[in-house]
Every structure is written in C-alpha cells, then in structure tokens.
C-alpha cells in the first residue's frame, strides 16, 4: 500500500494530505503545494518537498523570538517547477521572469537570465559531499564504527543502499560523507542520492520530514553524535556554466 493503511498518513513525508480515496478505498497521499500523488513507501523527491515547504503557511511552525543579532538563512529556498515525475525542471524562473538552469538537486548551475534562457537537459548531480562538524566529545570516534553507523543510517532511515555511500572520511571533528550515483548505476526503485542528502540535511537541522518517526538520534557505540554545522557540495556530470565575472 502507498501509505500507513490504519490511520492513513504518509510515514516518509509529513508535508502531505492523505485520504482513503485511492483504488479500493486505499489510502492515497498528495504533496502539499503540487497536489501530486506521492509514494509513501520511499522518499519524496526534493523538488516536491521544496514546493510543499514554500506552500506551507508561514505561521505553521512554532514561533521563536530570535535574538537581535540573529542572521537570516534563506537556505537557498525557492518555489520550484517540478516535472510529472516530481523531478526539477531544468529551467527555473521566478515571478519576475528571471530564469536559471538547475541540476537534479535543484541547485543553480548557470548565471541568471531572462525568459529566453535555454536549459537543454536536466544535468545529473552524481557526487555529493556532505561535510559535517560534530560537537566536542570525550575522544574521537572510531573511524570504522562511524563509517558502519553512517552507512547503516542511510540504508535504514533513507532507503539508500550502502553501495551509493562511496566513502566516509573522518578527521576529528570533521566528518565527510561522499555519496556517488551515476545515471547508469541508479536502478528502478533506487533512492536518489540528492533526495537522501536532503532528508539527511533536514534531519540534522532538527526539521525531520518523516511522519511519526522520532528525530535523528545518531550514536556511535552508544556515544551521541551531535552535528554543529553542515555544508553540502554538489558535483554534476557536466560542469556548471558560470560567466567569468561571477568567479572574480
């Protein structure tokens, strides 16, 4: 079935509306914002999640009074256009007709242009480097224990097979997780590394996308692994096209 049958919810995506109106009275869930049906037995695509996030009422989150020194982090958020499969459309435009090309994880890979900008294909992000800094601990984590625990986490929580976790590097307090997935490697039913990385990023920030699943409690041999900061780097199968003036 596509969702939790007993109470008709979507365990892998809380940003959905579910009702028992599927074939044979089965539970069917639709993503907020797009209204697209989602498969609740796997991760929802990042494009649909971003769209849902942008459509969610801004006051739906718990309000916290920020300190006067707080900086705004917009997370590079925008309201994306998704194709019928839930993937990012290669060309994204905002309401003021400014357009740009994105990769398969929705990150801009060209300079911004106008409506005449062409993005011939959706370029695949085949290598993701997740750079984490953990809070101080009594001692360094054992590298092989950390490696095994992170691979297990991606398999158990994000449905990503360990074969796509290319490496786990560790130099206290920095942990780097390398995800690699070429087009040829990705079989039907395989979770996309971009989607897994996005779910992981939201979990690390304490903004879990799962419904009724506890928050991320990552432990290595019983010792909690608490992340202070996260940086994610994306490498595309075709290098991005930015003008030289952007690089100076």
């Amino acid at each position: 079935h596509t969702a939790a049958q007993d109470n008709c919810t979507c365990p892998t995506n809380k940003m959905t509306v579910c009702s028992p109106d599927g074939p044979g009275g089965r539970c069917q869930c639709r993503a907020l914002g797009s209204g697209m049906a989602v498969d609740c037995s796997t991760l929802t695509s990042k494009c649909l999640l971003l769209k849902a996030r942008m459509s969610a009422p801004k006051n739906a989150r718990t309000l916290v009074r920020p300190s006067e020194h707080a900086l705004v982090d917009n997370d590079g958020l925008y309201d994306p256009d998704c194709d019928p499969e839930g993937r990012f459309k290669a060309r994204q435009c905002n309401q003021t007709s400014v357009c740009w090309c994105v990769n398969s994880v929705g990150v801009r890979r060209t300079d911004k242009g106008d409506l005449s900008l062409r993005c011939d294909e959706l370029v695949r992000t085949h290598h993701i480097l997740i750079d984490l800094r953990h809070r101080p601990t009594a001692g360094a984590f054992n590298h092989s224990d950390l490696d095994a625990e992170l691979r297990r986490l991606f398999r158990e929580r994000y449905r990503l097979h360990p074969k796509f976790v290319a490496a786990v590097h560790y130099e206290q307090p920095t942990i780097q997780i390398e995800l690699r997935q070429n087009t040829s490697q990705k079989a039907a039913g395989d979770v996309d590394i971009g989607d897994a990385a996005y779910y992981f990023e939201r979990d690390i920030k304490g903004e879990s996308l799962f419904q009724g699943r506890g928050g991320l409690d990552l432990r290595v041999r019983g010792e909690p692994l608490q992340v202070e900061r996260t940086l994610i780097y994306y490498l595309d199968e075709i290098p991005p096209k930015f003008s030289m003036k952007r690089l100076t």
């Epitope: 365990p11 037995s41 796997t42 691979r151 297990r152 158990e156 097979h161 079989a187």
Partner: antibody, heavy 120, light 107 residues
Framework: EVKLDESGGGLVKPGGSLKLSCAAS????????MSWVRQTPEKRLEWVAT????????YYPDSVKGRFTISRDNAKNTLYLQMSSLKSEDTAMYYC?????????????WGQGTSVTVSS | EIQMTQSPASLSASVGETVTITCRAS??????LAWYQQKQGKSPQLLVY???TLAEGVPSRFSGSGSGTHFSLKINSLQPEDFGSYYC?????????FGAGTKLELK
C-alpha cells in the same frame, strides 16, 4: 540467545491465502531489518521479502510483488508474511531471518522454518 | 536481476583436506557477497558477509575472498562438522539472489 520461531505454515489450495508469523526473542527486535527467505523442494534458496527496522520500507522480488506483504509489530516482537493468490511454485520451507546489523542484507540468524504446500 | 553461479555443484573431500568453492556474479557486485552453510535438516547459517568478513562465532579455518564478479570460500583442514551444503548470496541491492548451492560430501 537469538531465537526466531516461525508458525502458520500448512497445506493450502492454489489461489488461497496464508499468514506466517515469526516470534523473535533474545535481541532488540526493533533495531533490526528482517527478511523472509524460502527454500524450494529442490533445495534452492529464494529471497521473499525484507522490511526495515521501523516498518517504513519494504522490498520484494517481482515473483511475489502484489501477492505477499511483509509487516512487523515491534511492540510484540513479531514479523509477519501475508501470502495471497498462492501458486504451486510458492511451495517451500519459509524461513524468518534477521538481517545483520551492519551486513546490508546478509542474514545472520535464521528460524527453523515453517512448511507451506500449495496443492489442489 | 543478478545471477549467481556456484561451482562445483558437489564435491567430495576428506577430513583434514582444504577445499575451495567458487561463486560468480553476472555483473559487478563489488564486495557485497555472503556465504552460508546448511547442514542436513537444519537452517542455513551465515559464515561470511561483505565477501571476506567472518560472521560471529565462525571458525578461522573458513575464509572468503574476491570482489567484482569472482568470489571464493576456502575451508582449511576440513572438520567432520563442515560437511553439508554451501550457498553464496549477493547483497548488492534488490532483488537478492542466491547461488544454487554446493554440496560438500565426505569422501
């Protein structure tokens, strides 16, 4: 001591249904991915279904997809396999297995098995 | 679907001998391979996973090797309790598939 006790097997007619159960003990059931594997009368091993630790993700081969459903009740330490539209080729010994914590689909403990015979 | 081909289908050996069973995958499975032992009338038992890692409690006379498409299980100095059937299984994604088995008999 890890124990996996299957039950629910028996003789069933083609097109019929059967629900297998597996009572687990001796380990933290809710922390482990679990699978069902069957062994045909010719002694071939065939993977049937897998469910992750909290029951969100399930996996099946094409041969049983849409006919078999794996589920679990972590409060009862029990794994289930609901089988419907049974065919003669489903005749086998069905084993409940625990997936190795770090072994990614390698099965480190197997139950004693429960026999399923599909015949008219 | 990845096909697993085991050889030989059966072999006879004596206590104290060293035997090797091989398993070939129809495509590259890197090191995602497990080996199981099944004694007559019993359930299978995990011996090796990730091609070469011995499961808990498995005697050191068993060793796994190989990567990519060719793998082997070696049993040094066969003991009476080692006779039975051996199966390989890839764990490189879904669907999981097993080899047809190798029956190891006492000569």
């Amino acid at each position: 001591e890890v124990k996996l006790d299957e039950s629910g097997g028996g003789l069933v007619k083609p097109g019929g249904s059967l629900k297998l159960s597996c009572a687990a003990s001796g380990f933290t059931f809710s922390s482990y991915t679990m699978s069902w594997v069957r062994q045909t009368p010719e002694k071939r091993l065939e993977w049937v279904a897998t469910i992750n630790s909290d029951g969100i993700y399930t996996y099946y081969p094409d041969s049983v997809k849409g006919r078999f459903t794996i589920s679990r009740d972590n409060a009862k330490n029990t794994l289930y396999l609901q089988m419907s539209s049974l065919k003669s080729e489903d005749t086998a010994m069905y084993y409940c297995t625990r997936v190795h914590y770090y072994g990614y689909d390698a099965m480190d403990y197997w139950g004693q098995g429960t026999s399923v015979t599909v015949s008219s | 679907e990845i096909q697993m081909t085991q050889s030989p289908a059966s072999l006879s050996a004596s206590v104290g001998e060293t035997v090797t069973i091989t398993c070939r995958a129809s495509e590259n499975i890197y090191s995602y391979l497990a080996w199981y032992q099944q004694k007559q009338g019993k359930s299978p038992q995990l011996l090796v996973y990730s091609a070469k890692t011995l499961a808990e409690g498995v005697p050191s006379r068993f060793s796994g090797s190989g990567s990519g498409t060719h793998f082997s299980l070696k049993i040094n100095s066969l003991q009476p309790e080692d006779f039975g059937s051996y199966y390989c299984q890839h764990h490189y994604g879904i669907p999981l598939t097993f080899g047809a088995g190798t029956k190891l008999e006492l000569k």
